[in-house]
Interface confidence: medium
């Protein structure tokens, strides 16, 4: 047992320290007092603390804890927020390019179908964007609407251009005939399969990133309980009451306290690990028909093939439709019909010919690798916070919550704390309601991610030439199909380097923390993600 330090006969040091926390000295005793009203820093002898000081220490301790937690998650939060923004914008760029390729296909091959085709194409891709961002739109509806709208124009402009104006009331009949006679063959179904699979995966990917942000934001802004505040006060400030201003808490003691305070948060760990691994699985499956970049940029070719299919069968179709729609007197039409001009961005068409070294797919993989370094983020938090707050090295000559000890013993500390506070009780309370809610959301997204990941044992051959399919090669299983026999138009051999088009290149490695208010520990943040290497058997 080390000798007790000489008491501060005047509480002078305590007064000067406390004044930094709370201007004015009315709460600080001038000389040590019995402290019988204290509830947290229970004195073994005279103390320089009052009940009001104790309350202030508790408030400060909880604020410190919140700041430590926020600085701990800063790099991870930045990583996900920036990538969510990059991917959302990149997906919108893909949609814009896909629309322009398709419009260019119509302009180059079927000028008589413009501007009506431009409108239908524009609205189709608007719906694609809305779907990716979470709108409640049915992909089959989108594709049906596109072909329903296109067929009357194809019929009246390409197949039967001599049709008198008086016969143009047959549009509704033509829309119906489009489905009944399968005038585009299996192409609409092929496009539905490709577009729905690739967009579903894209949508869930964005949804998962946004949930990641929500998880971090939730734990970032946790309010710690009063019990935790008392434990933190005892660890960080009660030593001051005895005039021990320079003494640091024992490392082992800090870990016990942090595990108690963070018992609820640490419960997220299991679901967070699963979230990152499920997201990785999803990303690994995002190629060919599960990759919207690949599918949407090849769509113009499949649509072109579908129109060629109609033209090949024009003779037979014209006869059948002539009989079917000859007496149609319906003057109304389904809402998508009327032409509405859109423009082609010629600048974008040139992009297709550039060699592009960075694809969305490589960016996704890079994100996953960075996220995996945070796989142990939640289980490592207590240790991280202790390593970023003042603790005594090697647990020697340190504060154990009650007194200065030569060596920290967890058992002794727990026995000594029994009367003051039950750590086990704190753990048993279970997570905060907000933490429970976020765990439920993680469970839900993890389930979605698992169901969206490509079925095991059906991995597609990545080496197949994705432009090599003829429309007849699809067979019954359209999962294996990717559209587009050659049509002498724009060849999208290289996927676009979308990030070059983004107004900003948000790379986490370049991210300075200096746009935020600097805290004393900001310079240590960058080392945090390496904790994963230490704590995680999964890495």
């Amino acid at each position: 047992q080390p000798p007790p330090p000489p008491p501060d006969a005047t509480c002078h040091q305590v007064r000067s320290f406390f004044q930094r926390l709370q201007p004015g000295l009315k709460w600080v005793p001038e000389t040590p007092v019995p402290g019988s009203d204290l509830q947290v820093c229970l004195p073994k002898g005279p103390t320089c603390c009052s009940r009001k000081m104790e309350e202030k220490y508790q408030l400060t301790a909880r604020l410190n804890m919140e700041q430590l937690l926020q600085s701990a998650s800063m790099e991870l939060k930045f990583l996900i927020i920036q990538n969510a923004a990059v991917f959302q914008e990149a997906f919108e760029i893909v949609v814009r390019h896909a629309k322009n390729y398709t419009n260019a296909m119509f302009k180059n091959n079927y000028p008589s179908l413009t501007p009506q085709a431009f409108e239908f194409v524009g609205e189709f891709f608007t719906d694609v964007s809305l779907y990716i961002l979470g709108s409640d739109i049915n992909v089959d509806d989108m594709v049906n609407e596109l072909f329903d709208s296109l067929f009357p124009v194809i019929y009246t402009q390409l197949m039967n251009p001599g049709l008198p104006d008086s016969a143009l009331d047959i549009n509704e009949c033509l829309r119906g005939a489009r489905r009944d006679l399968k005038v585009f063959g299996n192409f609409p179904k092929l496009i539905m399969t490709q577009v729905s699979k690739s967009l579903q995966v894209t949508r869930i990917f964005l949804q998962a990133l946004n949930l990641g942000i929500e998880v971090i934001n939730t734990t970032d802004h946790l309010k710690f309980s009063k019990d935790c505040g008392r434990m933190l006060t005892r660890m960080w400030y009660c030593s001051y009451c005895q005039g021990l201003m320079m003494v640091k808490p024992c490392g082992g003691y800090c870990n016990v306290v942090m595990q108690g305070c963070m018992a609820g948060v640490v419960e997220i760990d299991k679901y967070w690990r699963e979230y990152i691994l499920s997201l990785e699985e999803l990303v690994n499956g995002m190629y060919r028909i599960y990759d919207m970049e690949n599918v949407l940029l090849g769509l113009f070719s499949t649509i072109h093939d579908s129109i060629q299919y109609v033209q090949k069968n024009a003779g037979k179709l014209t006869t059948t439709i002539g009989k079917l729609c000859a007496h149609s007197q319906q003057r109304q039409y389904r809402s998508a019909y009327y032409p509405e001009d859109l423009f082609i961005d010629k600048k974008v068409l040139k992009v297709a010919h550039v060699e592009h070294e960075e694809t969305l797919s490589s960016r996704r993989r890079e994100l996953i690798q960075k996220l995996k370094s945070f796989i142990s983020f939640y289980s490592a938090l207590p240790g991280y916070i202790c390593s970023h707050s003042p603790v005594a090295e090697n647990d020697t000559l340190c504060w154990n919550g009650q007194e200065l000890v030569e060596r920290y013993s967890q058992k002794a500390a727990r026995n000594g704390m029994k009367n003051q506070f039950n750590l086990h009780e704190l753990k048993m309370k279970g997570p905060e309601p907000v933490v429970s809610q976020i765990i439920d959301k993680l469970k839900h997204i993890n389930q979605l991610l698992r169901t969206m990941s490509m079925p095991k044992g059906r991995v597609l051959d990545k080496n197949l030439d994705e432009e090599g399919f003829e429309s007849g090669d699809c067979g019954d299983d359209e999962d294996e199909c990717i559209g587009g026999s050659g049509d002498g138009m724009i060849k999208v051999k290289n996927q676009l380097r979308f990030l070059a088009e983004l107004a900003y290149d948000l790379d986490v490695d370049d991210a300075p923390g200096n746009s935020q208010q600097a805290t004393p520990k900001d310079n240590e943040i960058s080392t945090f993600h390496n904790l994963g290497n230490v704590h995680s058997p999964l890495k």
Epitope: F124, T126, Q332, S335
Partner: antibody, heavy 121, light 107 residues
Framework: EVQLVESGPGLVKPSQTLSLTCTVS??????????WNWIRQHPGKGLEWIGY???????DYNPSLRSRLTISQDTSKNQFSLKLSSVTAADTAVYYC?????????????WGQGTMVTVSS | DVVLTQSPSSLSAFVGDRVTITCQAS??????LNWFQQKPGKAPKLLIY???TLETGVSSRFSGSGSGTHFNLVISSLEPEDSATYYC?????????FGQGTKLEIK
């Protein structure tokens, strides 16, 4: 938040032309993906769709009003307008402007507060 | 034009009651039917779109069902503020058309 505000004379003489303007804020009449509509409601009666204009300037009208109707837009002022010629007492109504998405999401999600127009000599 | 016929044209019910308003289309409009609520002197407010999807911010007491030619709007437990006229509207065909309205009065 998108806001639409109708403006125009509250009283029009029979056989004259009714002119109304809808000013849009929080959104652009020239951006793709939306139809900008006029709808009217006769006193104590149901709603009647009049027509819409698209960002390209293309229009679509209710066949029952087509011969008397012109809908146009002024993108510089972010406005679209309705002109209904040869009005009669039957055109007395509250006129609303409203927005809807172009195709699969075709419900009217934003409406103006409405402006009452009376046709009377 | 597609004619939408609402029934009843008016009804009176007590707070807490469950009411159903029906909209019949003269031809198949798939799922493309919306429901609006209109209070005196106000613009209509979207409640349900595409037959059954609740608009954001609308009370879950409102629900819609149906497809093709027959559609229902159900208010599960009436509140005083539900006193209004309710309209159905189709957006499958041009011209877009509305039902004649159902006036709901709370006793």
């Amino acid at each position: 938040e998108v806001q639409l505000v109708e403006s125009g004379p509250g009283l029009v003489k029979p056989s004259q032309t009714l002119s109304l303007t809808c000013t849009v804020s929080g959104g652009s009449v020239s951006s793709g993906g939306y139809h900008w509509n006029w709808i009217r409601q006769h006193p104590g009666k149901g709603l009647e769709w009049i027509g819409y204009i698209f960002n390209s300037g293309n229009t679509d009208y209710n066949p029952s009003l087509r011969s008397r109707l012109t809908i146009s837009q002024d993108t510089s002022k972010n406005q679209f307008s309705l002109k209904l010629s040869s009005v009669t007492a039957a055109d007395t109504a509250v006129y609303y402007c409203a927005r809807h998405r172009s195709r699969l999401l075709r419900w009217f999600d934003y409406w103006g507060q409405g402006t009452m127009v009376t046709v009377s000599s | 034009d597609v004619v939408l016929t609402q029934s009843p044209s008016s009804l009176s019910a007590f707070v807490g009651d469950r009411v159903t308003i029906t909209c019949q289309a003269s031809q198949d409009i798939r799922k493309y039917l919306n429901w609006f609520q209109q209070k005196p002197g106000k613009a209509p407010k979207l409640l349900i779109y595409d037959a059954s999807t609740l608009e954001t911010g609308v009370s879950s007491r409102f629900s819609g069902s149906g497809s093709g030619t027959h559609f229902n709007l159900v208010i599960s437990s009436l509140e005083p503020e539900d006193s209004a006229t309710y309209y159905c509207q189709q957006h499958d065909f041009v011209p877009r058309t509305f039902g004649q309205g159902t006036k709901l009065e709370i006793k």
